[in-house]
């Protein structure tokens, strides 16, 4: 571990003296002196500072721009930033969630492995043998082929990854 520095935790060194840092939610107005304590002021409306600090300006809360498909997930406080998320059907383009894009749909032959959230896109997977998807969808999984046998029917047309099997009546001429 690093050896301890001249000033303690939640202090900073300035002009040969240790001054108290300002607590989260407050900004520095003036450093301490030999005779006075550090002077701090609360951040204003729509501002925040989330650490013990010596910042002279608070940070502005993030703006969730509806024109970019964003909405407020969690309102900011003097100690926390606003958290944005995307409108229904959309997801963030980055971890910082600065803009949104429409959820991707899975093409025919692919099914939804994981439904999209506000922060992650749809994950598609190819339909394996025995399953199909005949629609472009952001919700539909691959469906299993119909089991003709359980309906006392026979396969008339084989299924693919995009189509279901076609069942038909048993050939009655067969012994």
């Amino acid at each position: 571990p690093e050896p301890p520095t001249a000033c303690r935790e939640k202090q900073y060194l300035i002009n040969s003296q240790c001054c108290s840092l300002c607590q989260p939610g407050q900004k520095l107005v003036s450093d301490c002196t030999e005779f006075t304590e550090t002077e701090c002021l609360p951040c204003g409306e729509s501002e925040f500072l989330d650490t013990w600090n010596r910042e002279t300006h608070c940070h502005q809360h993030k703006y969730c721009d509806p024109n970019l498909g964003l909405r407020v997930q969690q309102k900011g406080t003097s100690e926390t930033d606003t958290i944005c998320t995307c409108e229904e059907g959309w997801h963030c383009t980055s971890e910082a969630c600065e803009s949104c894009v429409l959820h991707r749909s899975c093409s025919p032959g692919f099914g939804v492995k994981q439904i999209a959230t506000g922060v992650s896109d749809t994950i598609c997977e190819p339909c394996p043998v025995g399953f199909f998807s005949n629609v472009s969808s952001a919700f539909e999984k691959c469906h299993p082929w119909t089991s003709c046998e359980t309906k006392d029917l026979v396969v008339q047309q084989a299924g693919t990854n995009k189509t279901d099997v076609v069942c038909g009546p048993q050939d009655r001429l067969r012994a």
């Epitope: 050896p3 301890p4 520095t5 000033c7 303690r8 300035i14 002009n15 040969s16 002196t33």
Partner: antibody, heavy 116, light 107 residues
């Protein structure tokens, strides 16, 4: 009144170590940082490091941090500066000073001569 | 490291003259600048801290101004006892650094 009294002059051989003391009086020793500064003959002032006598925590000048150790004894209100692996260019007057908005009070200085 | 450039390096003035020394920092140091006086064979003294605050017991003929990167130290009326070397020092960012010094002499 605030006073910082340093130990006497030293003559040292290259490669050896020196320990300079700085006894403080006239104020609460633990409440102020102690700074160390040196001045080579005919040269300007060079900051060496700072110690918090209350916590024992310190910061050093990167140029000499591997060779300098600052300590403080609260029971005697004395700060110490030890410099090891001495070389001829360490010949200087070594000063301690009290912090608190600049180096507010200075010791009288300790001449350390490094010579073979 | 923050460099402090002090000028002039030496000056000669008459008793009663106004003497001005400048100190320029290589980057913004706000008002964390201190001025010291070093007389031969005497303890170094703090004259001004935070660029312009007179330290206790220092005569009012000494003054300072400036903020950011440019600072000025003034002796309004030079006295014989002011013969000394004067240093600026920044307390903004470690490592603390000093100017090269200005030697003041009497004509």
């Amino acid at each position: 009144q605030v006073q910082l009294v340093q130990s006497g002059a030293e003559v040292k051989k290259p490669g050896s170590s020196v320990k300079v003391s700085c006894k403080a009086s006239g104020y609460a020793f633990s409440d102020y940082l102690i700074e160390w500064v040196r001045q080579a003959p005919g040269q300007g002032l060079e900051w060496m490091g700072v110690i918090n006598p209350g916590s024992g925590g310190s910061n050093y000048n990167e140029k000499i941090k591997d060779r300098v150790t600052l300590t403080a004894d609260k029971s005697t209100s004395t700060a110490y500066m030890e410099l090891s692996s001495l070389r001829s260019e360490d010949t200087a007057v070594y000063y301690c000073a009290r912090g608190g908005g600049g180096f507010t009070y200075w010791g009288q200085g300790t001449l350390v001569t490094v010579s073979s | 490291d923050i460099q402090l450039t002090q000028s002039p390096s030496s000056l000669s003035a008459s008793v009663g003259d106004r003497v001005t020394i400048t100190c320029r920092a290589s980057q913004d140091i706000s008002n964390y600048l201190n001025w010291y006086q070093q007389k031969p064979g005497k303890t170094i003294k703090l004259l001004l801290n935070f660029a312009s605050r007179l330290h206790s017991g220092v005569p009012s003929r000494f003054s300072g101004s400036g903020s950011g990167t440019d600072f000025t130290f003034t002796i309004s009326s030079l006295q014989p006892e002011d013969i000394a070397t004067y240093y600026c020092q920044q307390g903004s960012t470690l490592p603390w650094t000093f100017g090269g010094g200005t030697k003041v002499e009497i004509k």
